[in-house]
Amino acid sequence: FERTRSLQDPCSNCPAGTFCDNNRNQICSPCPPNSFSSAGGQRTCDICRQCKGVFRTRKECSSTSNAECDCTPGFHCLGAGCSMCEQDCKQGQELTKKGCKDCCFGTFNDQKRGICRPWTNCSLDGKSVLVNGTKERDVVCGPSPADLSPGASSVTPPAPAREPGHSPQ
């Protein structure tokens, strides 16, 4: 198909950064300022994205590639190609329609984005809580209660130290 297209389409070989100009008998013309064509054979150039307001420019537009935006401090990108900027919250919070709200008891968020997630339920794995959870941190699960029964240890004891020059008995 590509070969057929190139044989039939007089525009197929205009390089990226140009367009096939129908107003000039289909010769290749450079993309005008603030526009680009990222592939060859284009009949028009696309308007460059402008990073305004809460968006800031991460990469300038060129004749062959669109501008890329990210978000100003205090915001983070959402969507393909950073199509939206969403307000950051503190760790231990989540963004609601009314703004940043603390995580409810039993949930945590260790990032500036996203939602509060429930603490891990250690007992589901037959383990106990070693370190309690907070709004910012998940619980740390420790060994199961059975592992802590007398005579059992969750930690392997170190091998006895040998004094220099003594061979083991």
Partner: nanobody, 121 residues
Framework: EVQLLESGGGEVQPGGSLRLSCAAS????????MGWYRQAPGKRREFVAA???????VYAESVKGRFTISRDNAKNTVYLQMSSLRAEDTAVYYC???????????????WGQGTLVTVKP
């Protein structure tokens, strides 16, 4: 306005050489393919050679190994170096700005006015 101005034609003996030039203006030269065509008395205009912006070249079978097309993007000029000229090379030689930077099955968007090359003993 697109302008193509050929020069370098003249009279030469068989086996001789000539270099034709085509000075271009009114468009972005470096991104477009250019070609040379010729028209002998009483015949149709025919393709001679073409060069793409990326410097890929194509030649008519009748001139392969004898003619060389080249370009200087800094000077907006395309050249046709002709050697081992024959009587059948006698023609008006035209510079053409090709559509869509194409050298395969090219079609001409704009023509120059032509320069006469005569090969005779």
């Amino acid at each position: 306005e697109v302008q193509l101005l050929e020069s370098g034609g003249g009279e030469v003996q068989p086996g001789g050489s000539l270099r034709l030039s085509c000075a271009a203006s009114g468009f972005t030269f470096s991104i477009n393919a250019m070609g040379w065509y010729r028209q002998a008395p009483g015949k149709r205009r025919e393709f001679v050679a073409a060069i793409e912006s990326g410097r890929n070249t194509v030649y008519a079978e009748s001139v392969k190994g004898r003619f060389t097309i080249s370009r200087d993007n800094a000077k907006n000029t395309v050249y046709l170096q002709m050697s081992s000229l024959r009587a059948e090379d006698t023609a008006v030689y035209y510079c053409g700005l090709l559509k869509g930077n194409r050298v395969v099955s090219p079609s001409v968007a704009y023509w120059g006015q032509g320069t006469l090359v005569t090969v005779k003993p």
